[in-house]
């Protein structure tokens, strides 16, 4: 969001009337109250960037991902037989990039008409919030699978069950967590007219009687507690974990066990450097540069991060796959075309593989030979 | 060069309109906004309104449904229509070029329109 | 509405001299404010935007300063066609002027 200029003689409280059209007058409307945006800012959004690169990148990013997750969605929850607190944090993953990706077509039409909101205020802030949230439930439901995947190194043996209830209350406090610090994305109002530009933007401008200042504490607290502590504890669980992997007995299996978890490490922190870190970072200096200065030189910038950051429910696959054995199988099948049971009734018959399948377990549990969660 | 002319100087009777005009040269009305400002005698200066280039606009709230501004494109000429007129309507009213953009002034003024209200 | 006071209301100076003109706005308005000067009869004309950005074609004689809540024009050495009005606009939240700083010959 960039910062607008409120042109009402009432100014606007947090929760104000925004904008509103009293009367048409020859080829325009007569607005009560009306934000002015600076040149470099209406250019951004009168621009290639984000009336073409940014469609592009949503429509990628929905093709792929809305097909991707709903496959993984349905492969843990009715295709996985044991509900290991992986293959729980997986589901959560993938739930939250499906609720933020099925808004994708309205936020692809949006840019596409010229960054012009046609669709009501309440479809902007769900899709704001939804936006948001994605991005940290991702955070906070990969820093729950990083870690996880370390403590089964450490701790193979365990009673699963517990272990599961604790993944589901986790995951539930998650979820929680993440409606009540997303709550004034939703409370705010997001729409608003810009006659010169004859647009209606969502959250692309935010008037500056919104009080940047709480946008700033606001985005600086979530990317300290939603981002920076969680990145912390991800980086320390896989720096931990290759430890150990270097360290751990080297056969054939744990050579694969360790290729496949450096294959997730490296997705992880793709991610990281891809979504999470120029969103997260982009967001607190463009709202400080608001505060401080009444404009962002940055507004570019941080339109562009934003829009890599939902890149997560594209990346998201490849962790399901390098964890999930089920997963793996049902994305190499659907690929291929083939059903996953024409390929298990071809594999009865083949005994060591099915051995192989059994104590090849890192995917779908941990990173040591025959242990499971 | 860049110009704004306003029409001549009007004496009006209470509760009667008056209608401003400024014609724009050396730049093209769509592209820009038409402020109007007004300078009551021996006071300050007062903003009215605003008409941008695509036709929206905006008014000050002390002067909301009395004031109407209209653009004519194919003349290049911007009106401001006053109605309800009273004596303190009395001052000298200039239309103001701006960009349309919050980091830019009105950076070319008209010469003024002096509209008297007087019964 | 942001309110903006200028002072002093009358400047008594001799040419040659240096003004220092102020304008304070009732909150931040950033750097979102212009100064006018007007002369008698005549329609103000833009002498600096955005608190320090000279206007094209007026002399350098006349600088802008300030942010925020505190804003300066100064004339550093004033000359005879620099006795006038000057006014403070801001453009961050409405339109709204100064009342205005009138520099009169000493």
């Known amino acids: 969001t960039i910062q607008g200029t409120n042109r009402s003689s009432k100014g606007r409280s947090l929760i104000g009337k925004v904008d509103g059209t009293s009367h048409v007058t020859g080829k325009g409307v007569t607005v009560e109250t009306v934000f002015s945006v600076d040149e470099f800012s209406a250019s951004v959004l009168t621009g290639k960037l984000t009336t073409v690169f940014l469609p592009i990148v949503y429509t990628i990013v929905f093709v792929v991902g809305l097909p991707s997750n709903g496959m993984a969605l349905w492969v843990f929850l009715f295709r996985t037989k044991k509900k290991h607190p992986a293959v729980i944090y997986m589901a959560n993953l993938a739930l939250a990039d499906l609720l933020s990706v099925i808004w994708f077509p309205l936020k692809i039409a949006y840019h596409i008409h010229g960054n012009n909101w046609i669709y009501g205020e309440a479809l902007c802030n769900v899709l704001i919030g939804f936006f948001y949230g994605n991005m940290y439930c991702s955070i906070l439901f990969m820093t729950c699978l990083s870690v996880q995947r370390y403590w089964v190194i450490v701790n193979p043996m365990g009673h699963s069950r517990k272990k599961a209830n604790i993944a589901i209350g986790i995951s539930l406090a998650i979820w929680l967590l993440i409606l009540l610090v997303t709550i004034p994305l939703y409370v705010v109002k997001q729409t608003i007219f810009i006659p010169a530009l004859n647009i209606t933007t969502c959250h692309d401008v935010l008037p500056e009687q919104l009080l940047v200042g709480d946008m700033f504490n606001y985005f600086l607290s979530l990317a300290i507690g939603v981002f920076l502590f969680p990145a912390f504890l991800t980086a320390s669980a896989y720096v931990l974990m290759i430890r150990m992997l270097r360290s751990s007995a080297m056969d054939e299996n744990s050579e694969k066990k360790r290729k496949r978890a450096i294959k997730l490490i490296v997705t992880v922190l793709a991610m990281y450097l891809i979504c999470f870190t120029p969103s997260n970072l982009l967001l607190v200096v463009h709202y400080f540069l608001i505060k401080s200065q009444g404009q962002s030189h940055v507004y570019a910038l941080y339109i562009v991060a934003l829009c890599l950051s939902t890149l997560n429910s594209c990346i998201d696959p490849f962790v399901y796959y390098f964890v999930s054995h089920d997963f793996r199988d049902h994305a190499k099948n659907a690929l291929l075309c083939r059903s996953v049971r024409t390929v298990k009734q071809m594999q009865v018959s083949l005994t060591s593989k099915k051995h192989s399948r059994k104590s090849s377990s890192y995917s779908s549990s941990s990173t040591t030979v025959k242990t499971s969660y | 060069q860049v110009q704004l002319v306003q029409s001549g100087a009007e004496v009006k009777k209470p509760g009667s309109s008056v209608k401003v005009s400024c014609k724009a040269s050396?730049?093209?009305?769509?592209?820009?906004?038409i402020s109007w400002v007004r300078q009551a005698p021996g006071q300050g200066l007062e903003w009215m309104g605003v008409?941008?280039?695509?036709?929206?606009?905006y008014y000050a709230q002390k002067f909301q449904g009395r004031v109407t501004i209209t653009a004519d494109e194919s003349t290049s000429t911007a009106y401001m229509e006053l109605s309800s007129l009273r004596s303190e309507d009395t001052a000298v009213y200039y239309c103001?070029?701006?960009?349309?953009?919050?980091?830019?002034?009105?950076?070319?003024w008209g010469q003024g329109t002096l509209v008297t209200v007087s019964s | 509405e942001i309110v903006l006071t200028q002072s002093p209301a009358t400047l008594s100076l001799s040419p040659g001299e240096r003004a220092t003109l102020s304008c304070r706005a009732s909150?931040?308005?950033?750097?979102?404010l212009d100064w006018y000067q007007q002369k008698p009869g005549q329609a103000p004309r833009l002498l600096i935007y955005?608190?320090?950005s000279l206007a094209t074609g007026i002399p350098a004689r006349f600088s802008g300063s300030g942010s925020g809540r505190d804003f300066t024009l100064t004339i550093s050495s004033l000359e005879p066609e620099d006795f006038a009005v000057y006014y403070c606009?801001?453009?961050?939240?409405?339109?709204?002027f100064g009342g205005g700083t009138k520099v009169e010959i000493k």
């Open positions: 103001a070029r701006w960009r349309g953009f919050k980091d830019y002034p009105f950076d070319y």
């Open positions: 050396g730049f093209s009305l769509s592209s820009y906004a």
């Open positions: 008409i941008w280039g695509n036709g929206n606009t």
């Open positions: 909150q931040n308005i950033y750097k979102w």
């Open positions: 955005n608190a320090y």
């Open positions: 606009q801001q453009h961050n939240s409405g339109w709204t």
